[in-house]
């Protein structure tokens, strides 16, 4: 029926989306004027806004021509499919003057057996089929072409790859008589890259493979394979890098052990162990060699796979990630948190921080949240006074003309940004928390008290009185 979100079926099937490049509309300039600055000092936001304003003023009626949308292209190679056998695809917005390409892998959990894949197919079909995908998508956050929203890479060629393989982007098995579903996540990425070579990627200087949640883990699993593919195809000069957002999970013990029946109740190791078999999942070759046969599931966990990767990867991870807490069976309800759970949550943050100590390019705020890079307000959170777009810009500079991060960080341009304060939302720039049961916004002080933190205990290490700390937190300082 009508009135539903754009990707929903509306009775009649729309004609299939075009599989070819559209010619420029009459009166639309074919050439563009690239403004691809890799390192801009000072006030990036204001500088980019001025540049954009100047660029727009060069065209008559430029406002109408600024199309924010990425356009759907279903893969020409229809043997590379979503779970249900429909062709996989990607959304593209070209920026013809730019030699930067951002390929974003969507997230959306996974399914790991026939039962929960069937259920996923009947309730979240867009994550398993391309049949009802909309023709266009709007780029947000790091996929936005607005310098105000994306001071980092607003001028890049933007590619959004929808997640329709339910396999954490790891599979390479087609649908068959034996397999009700195809799991081809890894092959989808490879095929998108192959097709994009014919659409300008061949002239790229940098390909940034980014992703959130399951897509973030997908980056860790596929970034080296993308680099190898480009080398094999004769494009060794394209620098391949990774940006993994909210995909750095821990294979820790659940707070409360639960049976592995449903995706969200299943312990991380159990889910991936089952999944990798069901999907015929592939992991990076160098990581696979480190673990014996049957133990490849280890490579789905960031801290184990990261040391084996050749490509530079920037890791973005909330220290108190909601998806991690969910698989750990932590459900923050309206009740004040008991001490055992509070300690478990604090320890999770500590463990996560520890796994990032040898990750030179990382951004880990002490917040309770999940995903960040395609949120419109991804620029708001800061760690030690540095925002994520700024940290990524510094990372770009540190990698300039080099495939490996230089050992000495650039002065005033940090790339290793991990919060050291020990409790959720001790960073005042964290996204607003809402009480899950009233829907009301909570300030940090309210949230901490709700979490069962004794203000005396929290204030003491800071050398503060509880009242002083409450005042500081309430003011967001």
């Amino acid at each position: 029926s009508e009135g539903r979100k754009t990707w929903r079926r509306r009775g009649q099937q729309p004609p299939p989306p075009p599989r070819t490049e559209a010619a420029p509309a009459a009166g639309q300039p074919v050439e563009s004027f690239p403004l691809d600055f890799t390192a801009v000092e000072g006030n990036m936001d204001s500088f980019m806004a001025q540049v954009k304003s100047l660029a727009q003023s060069l065209y008559p009626c430029s406002a109408q021509q600024l199309n924010e949308d990425l356009r759907l292209h279903l893969l020409l190679n229809t043997s590379v499919t979503c779970n249900d056998g429909s062709p996989a695809g990607y959304y593209l917005k070209e920026s013809r003057g730019s030699r930067r390409w951002l390929l974003f892998l969507e997230g959306g959990w996974y399914c790991f057996n026939r039962e929960n894949c069937d259920s996923r197919y009947d309730t979240m079909r867009r994550l398993m089929s391309s049949r009802d995908w909309p023709r266009t998508r709007t780029g947000t956050g790091i996929l936005s072409s607005q310098p105000e929203e994306n001071p980092y890479w607003w001028n890049a060629n933007m590619v959004f790859i929808p997640y329709c393989s339910s396999d954490v982007w790891s599979g390479a098995s087609p649908k068959s008589d034996k397999n009700e579903y195809a799991f081809m996540g890894s092959l989808i990425i490879q095929e998108v890259v192959r097709e994009l070579l014919g659409k300008g990627l061949s002239g790229a200087k940098v390909l940034l493979l980014a992703g959130s949640s399951a897509g973030g883990t997908g980056v860790l699993l596929n970034v080296d394979r993308v680099a190898e593919l480009l080398e094999e195809l004769g494009y060794p000069s394209i620098q391949v890098r990774g940006l993994a957002d909210s995909g750095w999970f821990l294979d820790n013990k659940q707070y409360r052990r639960s049976d592995c029946i449903d995706t969200i109740n299943c312990a991380p190791t159990d889910a991936i162990r089952r999944g990798i078999r069901y999907w015929s999942g592939m992991v990076p070759e160098r990581c696979q060699r480190q673990f014996k046969e049957g133990e490849e599931w280890n490579c789905f966990f960031g801290y184990k796979v990261y040391p084996t990767l050749r490509c530079p990867v920037f890791v973005v991870q909330w220290l108190f990630d909601e998806a991690q807490l969910t698989v750990d069976n932590v459900h923050l309800t309206g009740q004040p948190v008991q001490e055992g759970l509070r300690l478990y949550i604090q320890n999770l943050g500590r463990e996560l921080r520890h796994t990032l100590k040898d990750v030179p390019a990382s951004f880990a705020p002490a917040c309770l949240s999940h995903e960040i890079i395609i949120r419109s307000h991804w620029t708001d959170v800061q760690v030690k006074g540095t925002s994520l777009p700024r940290a990524l810009h510094c990372w770009d500079r540190s990698l300039h003309d080099s495939h490996k991060a230089s050992k000495t960080p650039l002065k005033g341009c940090p790339v290793h940004l991990v919060d050291s304060c020990p409790w959720p939302h001790c960073n005042p720039s964290c996204p607003t928390v809402r009480d899950q049961f009233t829907g009301q916004e909570m300030n940090v002080a309210q949230f901490l008290m709700h979490m069962g933190f004794d203000m005396q205990t929290v204030a003491q290490p800071q050398g503060l009185e509880p009242s002083e700390l409450l005042g500081m937190l309430s003011n967001g300082s």
Partner: antibody, heavy 119, light 111 residues
């Protein structure tokens, strides 16, 4: 026009059996997960069972597990619910509902069939 | 299983006023940008009718005076302005994972 029509209700003795049917029309039946929901007299809605679009997965509420068998015939556009070892607490109006595949909400309901378990 | 707690059990609202019904889940029913909570209206002798799906989307043909909001585990159905024909029982329902469950219902009476 999308339609669901339940049948098979009636009066049954405790311990007895009954098979309910739901005939679907106006849509591609094999494309949708189907559910049974029941409502005891003057009570709220209770989710009972789910059959996946292909019929390969079924799932039951704990209250009925082991006593109900859900099946579907996609070639005949029909959903079945076979009930055994019936108890008085199974007395209810039984609705068949179609779940939208973009969210799992029930966008189409049948009129229901009434089952009474009594001696 | 996810338990849905609906409140109040019943409410009486004057014609033209606002009716607010709350539904709380025992754990989050939101994932991948969507909240898997839906609202139905049921009148005596009739099957339930879908009003709001995915927390806030209005089903086609449903008057705009019905609206839904919320995320995570806290959801609200608002009816404003209430009309005579809105007297019914309202249920929330989640489809985040199996088994699906319903709230216990809220009976709305028009004063």
């Amino acid at each position: 026009d999308v339609q669901l029509l339940e049948s098979g209700g009636g009066l049954v003795q405790p311990g007895g059996s009954r098979k309910l049917s739901c005939a679907a029309s106006g849509f591609t039946f094999s494309d949708f997960g189907m559910h049974w929901v029941r409502q005891a007299p003057e009570k709220g809605l209770e989710w009972v069972a789910y059959s996946s679009s292909g019929g390969t997965t079924v799932y039951y509420a704990d209250t009925v597990k082991g006593r109900l068998t859900l099946s579907r015939d996609n070639s005949k556009n029909t959903l079945f619910l076979e009930m055994t070892s019936l108890r008085s607490e199974d007395t209810a109006m039984y609705y068949c509902a179609r779940a939208s595949y973009d969210g799992g909400y029930f966008d189409c309901w049948g009129q229901g069939t009434s089952l009474t378990v009594s001696s | 299983d996810i338990v849905l707690t609906q409140s109040p059990a019943s409410l009486a609202v004057s014609l033209g006023q606002r009716a607010t019904i709350s539904c709380r889940a025992s754990k989050s029913v939101s994932t991948s940008g969507y909240s898997y909570i839906h609202w139905y209206q049921q009148k005596p002798g009739q099957p339930p009718k879908l009003l709001i799906y995915l927390a806030s989307d209005l089903e086609s043909g449903v008057p705009a005076r019905f609206s839904g909001s919320g995320s995570g585990a806290a959801f609200t159905l608002n009816i404003h302005p209430v009309e005579e024909e809105d007297a019914a029982t309202y249920y929330c329902h989640h489809s985040r994972e199996l088994p699906f469950t319903f709230g216990s219902g809220t009976k709305l009476e028009i004063k």
